[in-house]
Structure formats: C-alpha cells, structure tokens
C-alpha cells in the first residue's frame, strides 16, 4: 500500500468517525426537540425552569437536529463507501453552510442598526400583546427566558411593562411587572422566585397548557426586581461574551472548511487510486 | 392605612449638611418605594430621588453629588441627606409611598438654608 | 433629563365647567405619566397614573389621556373643591421630573 493510499484511508476513517459523532450528536439534538415537542410537563420538571421557551426551541432543536443528520449521514457513508457523489453532496452542503455564516456574519456587522431596530420592534410588539392570545405564547415565554438569563426587565427600562393591561394591579398599585423581572438574589432566598411562580400558577406545567389572564404572574414593580433594560443587559453580555461567541464561529468555521478540504481531497483522488487499482486487474 | 411622617431640622446654615427620616407605617419597605420631592416656597415640585424595596436608588442628576437616601426596614424609616447646602435648598421637603407614581405623601418638613 | 412642559400655567374657570390641562414632555415617555393635585398649604394628591389609571378614591369627573409626548387631564363639570394646582410627573427612564404647575382658579 503506497503512502498516498494510507494517506487517502486515514482521511476516508477520519472522516467517517467524526461524522458519525456529529450524527449521533445530532440524533441526540433531534430527540431532545421531540421530547420538548411532546411531553413538554415532564420536561419542564426534569430541567426545573417553568418558563423555557419550549414551543420555540423544541422546533429549533428539532431542525438542527435533523439537519447535522443529514449532513453527517452524507459524510458518514460517503467517506465509507467512497461514493462521489455523497462526497460532492456533503461537500456542496457544508459549502452552503460556511457560506450561510459568513454572509450573516456580514449583515449582522454591516446592518447592525437595523437588526438592533427590527428586534427592538419585535420585543416591543411582544410586550405589548403580552398575555393577550392564550394559544400563542412562544414569544412571551422567549422574552421571559431572556428577561430571567440576562436579569433584566422590558426592552428600555421596567417601565415598557406599565402598559400591559393584563399585568395592571389596582388604583395605586398599578405599576406590575411579569415574574421573570423578579430578582430571588436579592432577597437572601434562591426559591423566592418558584415559590412566587408556582403558587401563583399553582401547576407545574402551566406552560404546556394555553395560559388564561388568571394565569399571569406579576410583581410590583417597586419591590426587588432587575432594574437595567434588556437592551443595555443584551450589550452587555454580548460585550462579555464576545470572544466566546468569535471564538466558537472561528471554531466552526475552520471545522467546516476541515471537512470540506478533507472530502474535496478524498473525491478528488478516489479517481487516481480506482485508475491504479484497475491497471493490475 | 398608610401612612408617611417627615421630620426635619427647621433651619440649616449653608454649607452645612440636611438630615430628614421619614417614618412609614402601613406597608413594607421591602415591596415599596419610598421618594423624596421638595418645594421651594411659592414654586413647583422638585423631584429628588427614590428607594427601592430592594435598597436600591435613583437620584435627580443634578444633586446625585450631594444627596443620599438610605433606609432602615427594622424601624421603618427612610432617610434623606443632602450636602453642602445652599439658600436654594430652601423647601418643604416630602417623603411619598411610591417609586413611580406616588401614592401617598407626608405632610413635609420646612427646611430653611440661613445664616 | 426629560422636561415636562405643562399649559396653561394658569385659568380661571367656573364650578359645572369642564377643563383640560396639557403635558408636553420634551421625548416620548410612553405613557409614564401621574397627575397631581395639591391645595393651598396641603401635600399633593395623586389622581392619574400611567397616564389613564385612575388613583384609589379619585372621582370618575378626572380623567387621563394622552400617548408618546402629549398627554392631558380632564376635569368634567368643576366641583368647588377642584380648584388648586396641579402638576403632571413622568417617570420614564431613570430620573423622574415634574412639570412647573395649572393654577386653577374660580372665575
């Protein structure tokens, strides 16, 4: 066996094995967004957060999940069975796929006003109509999550909350907050805030079932609550995070360009070596 | 029912410091603001700043240099200093259950900036 | 800082009249807005907030409107105990202002 030959064979496992830990991976995503999507009650008690966008995520997971499938199964058998055309097709996808990033990566540096604007608008548009369709409450629970992660409450400052009817108290006491606001820290006792939630909605997969304005938790708005809006903590965590998050695309990225280098170079060369092996027949 | 008492000096020199306690009952320091708004004799309301149940503090920008509120929950009280004070400090000087809208007021303390 | 700018400064109206005082504020403070009354020698009273919302015990001839950055209370059919200043305060943002005053006088 010539050099270029166990060159090509260590390409062709390399490839092999890590496609099938990004198929399993990906399995393994896919089956987490099916969970979600259908016991959503024994999910929210197995990870203890009530408000978890699940509707959302269980979907997004979903279609990752099937997706990094796919293009590891491509890889998986194309590599194995050094089939070109799978080899092309898992070469094609992962192409599409850098090519995907690096074009977000450039409208989110070039447009980044307008993205800021457009989610502004969005987030805005969901406190607005907060609690107001029981059946659509994907974006509510989203905003609750972020609000509850970067401990922060409405879009500007508390104050965007003040108009949501549903969350209104009475008279003097109107100015109410969602329970997501509720900062448990700082007052000395981490269950504040599920006992607040709980007993208020009294079962544990309320977010499973459509929400009734009875079923809305508030706070006042005065008592121990983030008091920094979104849009400053959101800068902030991506300031934070900021190398994390190049650090993480770069990763990828250059993954991305591994596999398709090494695929490239497996389909190239699976001709030269099928030419060879046919001169000694 | 609620209620909120201001008690203060009477009469500072300038320069000196100003110390009002405003005493609450009927509800909790903890789950309400407690803020402070002074009025110049014969003029409007001034906004001053605001305490949160959970100790946290807003001020008016132009006296966060010089004004401090601080509170107490096992007394009830709520305190305001305002420093280096001049004869424009000269006020009533409330203290109102409220952090935002605000609900219910003292009757004021008269605080007079004189030599 | 947000200025509050409040019209008229002064008015001379009858009891049964019907008055409506206004409130600029110099950005959008998305209805974050209380209405006041204070009598001669008396501490302030609140009567609106978040621009609509009635106070506890406050009589159903008040009434609040307003969105973005003009805003206005309404006072149907004037009860001699109407009359004082009042003083509409935004709290949006992070430092709360008052707006200079209505003087409302009997006629």
């Known amino acids: 066996m010539s050099a270029q030959e166990s060159c090509l064979s260590l390409i062709k496992y390399f490839l092999f094995v890590f496609n099938l830990f990004f198929f399993v991976l990906g399995s393994l995503i896919f089956c987490f967004g099916i969970w979600i999507l259908i016991d959503k009650t024994s999910f929210v008690s197995f990870v203890g957060l009530a408000f978890v966008p699940l509707q959302i995520w269980s979907k997004v997971l979903a279609i990752s999940g099937i997706f990094t499938m796919g293009i590891a199964l491509l890889g998986c058998v194309g590599a194995l069975k050094e089939l070109r055309c799978l080899l092309g097709l898992y070469f094609g996808m992962l192409l599409l796929l850098f090519a995907t990033q690096i074009t977000l990566g450039i409208l989110i540096s070039t447009q980044r006003a307008q993205l800021e604007r457009s989610l502004r608008d969005v987030v805005e548009k969901t406190i607005q109509k907060y609690g107001t369709n029981p059946e659509e409450t994907a974006a509510e629970e989203s905003w609750d999550y972020v609000q509850f992660q970067l401990r922060c409450c409405g879009w500007h400052y508390p104050q965007d909350w003040f108009q949501v009817l549903i969350l209104r108290g009475n008279g003097s006491e109107a100015h109410r907050v969602p329970c997501s606001c509720y900062n448990s820290t700082a007052t000395n006792d981490s269950t504040v805030f599920d006992k607040l939630f709980f007993s208020q909605l009294s079962r544990l997969g309320h977010l499973a079932r459509s929400r009734h304005s009875a079923d809305i938790c508030a706070v006042p708005a005065e008592s121990h609550i983030y008091r920094e809006g979104c849009a400053q903590g959101l800068q902030k965590w991506l300031h934070n995070n900021l190398i994390s998050i190049v650090g993480i695309c770069l990763g990828v990225g250059l993954l991305e360009l591994g596999f398709m280098t090494l695929s490239i170079f497996l389909c190239r060369n699976l001709d030269h070596v099928y030419n060879r092996l046919a001169r000694y027949r | 029912q609620v209620q909120v008492k201001e008690s203060g000096p009477g009469l500072v020199a300038p320069s000196q410091s100003l110390s009002i306690t405003c005493t609450v009952s009927g509800f909790s320091l903890t789950t309400s603001g407690v803020s402070w708004v002074r009025q110049p004799p014969g003029k409007g309301l001034e906004w001053l700043g605001v305490?949160?149940?959970?100790?946290?503090?807003n001020y008016h920008s132009a006296l966060k240099s010089r004004l401090s509120i601080k509170k107490d929950h096992s007394k009830s009280q709520v305190f305001l200093k305002l420093n280096s004070l001049q004869t424009d400090d000269t006020a009533t000087y409330y203290c109102?259950?409220?952090?935002?809208?605000?609900?219910?007021w003292g009757q004021g303390t008269l605080v007079t900036v004189s030599a | 800082d947000i200025q509050m700018t409040q019209s008229p400064a002064s008015l001379s109206v009858s009891v049964g009249e019907t008055v409506t005082i206004t409130c600029r504020a110099s950005?959008?403070?998305?209805?974050?807005l209380a209405w006041y009354q204070q009598k001669q020698g008396k501490s302030p009273q609140l009567l609106v907030n978040?621009?609509?919302n009635l106070a506890d015990g406050v009589p159903s001839r008040f009434s609040g409107s307003g969105s973005g950055t003009q805003y206005s209370l309404k006072i149907n059919s004037l009860q001699s105990e109407d009359f004082g200043t009042y003083y509409c305060q935004h709290y949006w943002g992070t430092t709360w202002t008052f707006g200079g005053g209505t003087k409302l006088e009997i006629k």
């Open positions: 305490i949160w149940g959970d100790g946290s503090t």
């Open positions: 109102a259950k409220g952090g935002y809208s605000l609900a219910h």
């Open positions: 950005e959008n403070i998305r209805s974050n």
């Open positions: 978040v621009a609509t």
